[in-house]
């Protein structure tokens, strides 16, 4: 029977900068029941606080609700593991909520085949940012990525759309049914999950174009 091994805080995520959750990985348990506590202070403060909510994020987690979340302030946190034989501490983790946002996927992805009379046909898609993200304040810049593939293909073709919420693709296989998805990430932060797939049938008379793609 031994003191617990050193835990590690390995992940923190926020859906929208208003709340966030951090997760830790326990070290060895030393063969005894082990209690974990997360303590933190905000940069510039000496007062230590204990995790406000160990439940919401699931096992080995700490959730910070709205009243505990401040932007532009670094949180310095650590996890203490204790059993009857002693204690061990994780390394301190420095967290700035601005940098740990993982948004929901973009919404309302619509995909259409456009066949203008005077130009080559193209695939046109547009989408909306996730609802929880407030882009009007200027605190967020969202970047988008699109992927698509013929229904039976194994490989995805990926395109970076920058900050645009619409995109054109000019080179596709006629007669194929395509799956299209979009995801987003803040300029500092993490990619969202991919949006649900949207299916589009490319007409058999779709003319292949030498130029690959461009965005508005």
């Amino acid at each position: 029977q031994l003191p617990p091994g050193k835990p590690e805080i390995f992940k923190c995520r926020s859906p929208n900068k208003e709340t966030f959750t951090c997760w830790w990985r326990p070290g060895t348990d030393g063969g005894l029941p082990t209690n974990y506590s997360l303590t933190y202070h905000r940069e510039g403060e000496t007062l230590m606080h204990e995790c406000p909510d160990y439940i919401t994020g699931g096992p080995n987690s700490c959730h910070f609700g709205k009243q505990y979340t401040s932007m532009w302030r670094t949180y310095v946190m650590m996890v203490n593991a204790t059993n009857q034989m002693g204690s061990s501490f994780s390394d301190e983790l420095y967290v700035d909520v601005t940098y740990i946002v993982q948004p929901d996927p973009p919404l309302e992805l619509t995909v259409e085949v456009k066949q203008p009379e005077d130009r080559k046909p193209y695939l046109w898609m547009k989408w909306s940012p996730p609802t929880l993200i407030d882009l009007k304040t200027g605190w967020f810049t969202l970047l988008y990525e699109i992927r698509l593939k013929p229904e039976k293909a194994a490989e995805w073709e990926t395109h970076f759309a920058g900050q645009q919420t619409e995109f054109k693709i000019l080179s596709l296989h006629p007669g194929q049914k395509y799956l299209v998805q979009v995801r987003c990430k803040p300029d500092h932060g993490y990619w969202s999950a991919w949006s649900p797939a949207t299916f589009i049938q490319i007409p058999s008379d779709f003319i292949m174009n030498d130029h690959h793609h461009h965005h508005h």
Epitope: Y94, K185, Y190, W191
Partner: antibody, heavy 120, light 107 residues
């Protein structure tokens, strides 16, 4: 204990490429951004770029955008920096440096440095 | 790019002296400044982040004041292990940039 162990010194010809590795241990590799910084002999520090090992998303100093490539191998917790079209001015010690936290780009852990000498 | 201008480029001082190093940013950087110490043949070591926060384990004799464009690193009572080169760094906007360094030498 957090450690960043870099590959050994390299001597390269002008016009060639070099690939420097940085093996991380003592923490979860995908948690923190990894940065590359260089220091020419007797000079200051110059930031080359950064990569998020969780998804390989990277940002570069425009000065190096066309010549530097940052990659990671999550299976071995190793970051790489490749610099192409080498010239004598690229002679420097190249450092990998781990982001200090989940936040802005200050660097709490540094590799021991890899000296790259470019000479004909 | 934001230029970080450090002064002086070198300073001679004795053990126990108070040493100040300044760093001036060419544009507003808020408090997005870090300071590093580097000894010959070694990697830099983080001292201060966010302009005024000492990193874990850094002695209290190191402090920073300033925000916006002007920053000062102060070593309140110089110790033998403090003779080294000091760099400031801004992380307000890409590309992250460093000052040219200040060498603190033994008088």
């Amino acid at each position: 204990e957090v450690q960043l162990v870099q590959s050994g010194a390299e001597v390269k010809k002008p016009g060639s490429s070099v690939k420097v590795s940085c093996k991380a241990s003592g923490y979860t590799f995908t948690t923190y951004w990894m940065h590359w910084v260089r220091q020419a002999p007797g000079q200051g520090l110059e930031w080359i770029g950064e990569i998020d090992p969780s998804d390989s998303y990277s940002n570069y100093n425009q000065k190096f955008k066309d010549r530097a490539t940052l990659t990671v191998d999550k299976s071995t917790s190793t970051a790489y920096m490749e610099l192409s079209s080498l010239r004598s001015e690229d002679t420097a010690v190249y450092y990998c440096a781990r982001n200090g936290g989940l936040g802005p780009a200050w660097f709490s852990y540094w590799g021991q440095g890899t000296l790259v000498t470019v000479s004909s | 790019d934001i230029q970080m201008t450090q002064s002086p480029s070198s300073v001679s001082a004795s053990v126990g002296d108070r040493v100040t190093i300044t760093c001036k940013a060419s544009q507003y950087v808020g408090t997005a400044v870090a300071w590093y110490q580097q000894k010959p043949g070694k990697s830099p070591k983080l001292l201060i982040y966010s302009a005024s926060n000492r990193y874990t384990g850094v002695p209290s004799r190191f402090s920073d004041s300033g925000s916006g464009t002007d920053f000062t690193l102060t070593i309140s009572s110089l110790q033998p292990e403090d003779f080294a080169t000091y760099f400031c760094q801004q992380y307000s906007s890409y590309p992250w940039t460093f000052g040219g360094g200040t060498k603190v030498e033994i008088k």
